[in-house]
């Protein structure tokens, strides 16, 4: 026994909107079109967006999203109370902070209300899906004549839960120097050249103590230190993402 899936070979490895031509064993009902995948991210532990590609539906369909946690007093699914829309069709759900339980298995069900048998249930570890806000309030101070310290702040998330990526370069550098800083929102550069102008920026992720998120935050606003007179090639300051 085997099943067939029609898909374009160019996207063989990642094509998600599959067309089922035969279905699982002992299922005698007519095959149904698979639903789009739901992707969830928890933004700074303030709210969560669970979204799907509504344009993958052959006809405009207002899919519904229900969710629950694996271990909870009320084990029934609750429907999304704040849908996100794309071209007037549901394409996501925003879940507020009080409904987020980072360390319980999150169970999410997407369903076609016109065809109740068309449903998909996914399970997610939310602690691996946290995206922090960009670090803020970057400040530079001189620890000594040639030593600089960079400090920053992160809102709403405990510092010990975050890992930081610091990038810096001088106006003489063509590429960034980068390093990982764990849990401490500070970094010191032991030797700086006062004739150069330095640019620093930082981003963070929820890893590895409290979660295993691979997603970095956006970059902080850059901060600068040093001479403003030696800018040989201003184009070097274009910050690539």
């Amino acid at each position: 026994w085997s099943s067939k899936v029609l898909m374009s070979s160019a996207n063989e490895d990642i094509k998600a909107d599959l067309i089922l031509t035969s279905t699982a064993p002992e299922h005698l009902s007519a095959p149904t079109l698979p639903l789009p995948e739901v992707q969830c991210f928890v933004f700074n532990i303030e709210y969560m967006n669970c979204t799907w590609n509504s344009s993958s539906e052959p006809q405009a369909t207002n899919l519904t999203l229900h969710y629950r946690y694996k271990v909870s007093d009320n084990n029934t699914f609750q429907e999304c109370s704040h849908y996100l829309f794309s071209k007037e069709i549901t394409s996501g759900c925003q879940i507020q902070k009080e409904d987020i339980q980072l360390y319980q298995t999150f169970v999410v069900q997407l369903q076609d209300p016109q065809k109740p048998q068309r449903r998909a249930v996914q399970k997610l570890n939310l602690q691996n899906l946290v995206i922090p806000r960009a670090p803020e309030n970057l400040t530079l101070s001189n620890l000594s004549e040639s030593q600089l310290e960079l400090r920053w702040k992160s809102r709403h998330i405990k510092e010990r839960c975050l890992q930081y990526l610091v990038q810096y370069r001088s106006n003489r550098d063509r590429s960034w120097t980068e390093l990982i800083v764990n849990h401490e929102p500070r970094f010191s550069l032991p030797s700086v050249d006062e004739l150069k102008r330095y640019t620093f920026r930082v981003r963070s992720r929820y890893n590895p103590i409290c979660g295993s998120s691979q997603q970095w935050s956006k970059w902080s606003q850059p901060v600068h230190w040093g001479s403003h007179t030696v800018e040989e090639n201003p184009s070097l300051f274009a910050l690539e993402a």
């Epitope: 998600a16 599959l18 699982a24 995948e37 969830c40 899906l129």
Partner: nanobody, 126 residues
Framework: EVQLVESGGGLVQAGDSLRLSCVAS????????MGWFRKAPGKEREYVAI???????FYEDSVEGRFTFSRDNAKNTVYLQMNSLRPEDTAVYYC????????????????????WGQGTQVTVSS
């Protein structure tokens, strides 16, 4: 055409162990959500263990702590290590695959899987 072939089933005593294997041919499993499901006579099919290609794995409550899902992408194979087997684990065990875009997708709904194996019988006697 994708083929999933399970093996490793058999007749064992309660408390024994078995390791099921599922080998895929025709495409790589490296970007597939995978699932092990089982169907006992007169019962609904249920998921046993499901896994995203990013590595998140979830187990049905009754097997948590006894069964372990693993995958070997180099061999295009997934495994289900079953320890401390009980008579109620008796069923036909199926391996299923769903190509996915996202590393975090793990499906517990059987109709989300595109590819299925033919099943392997596991019988646990008391």
């Amino acid at each position: 055409e994708v083929q999933l072939v399970e093996s490793g089933g058999g007749l064992v005593q309660a408390g024994d162990s078995l390791r099921l294997s599922c080998v895929a041919s025709g495409r790589t499993l490296s970007r597939c959500a995978m699932g092990w499901f089982r169907k006992a006579p007169g019962k609904e099919r249920e998921y046993v263990a499901i896994s995203s290609w990013g590595g998140d794995t979830f187990y049905e409550d009754s097997v948590e702590g006894r069964f372990t899902f693993s995958r070997d992408n180099a061999k295009n194979t997934v495994y289900l290590q079953m320890n401390s087997l009980r008579p109620e684990d008796t069923a036909v065990y199926y391996c299923a695959a769903a190509p996915t875009s996202f590393a975090t997708t793990a499906y517990s709904s059987s109709n989300s899987y595109a590819y299925w194996g033919q099943g392997t019988q596991v019988t646990v006697s008391s």
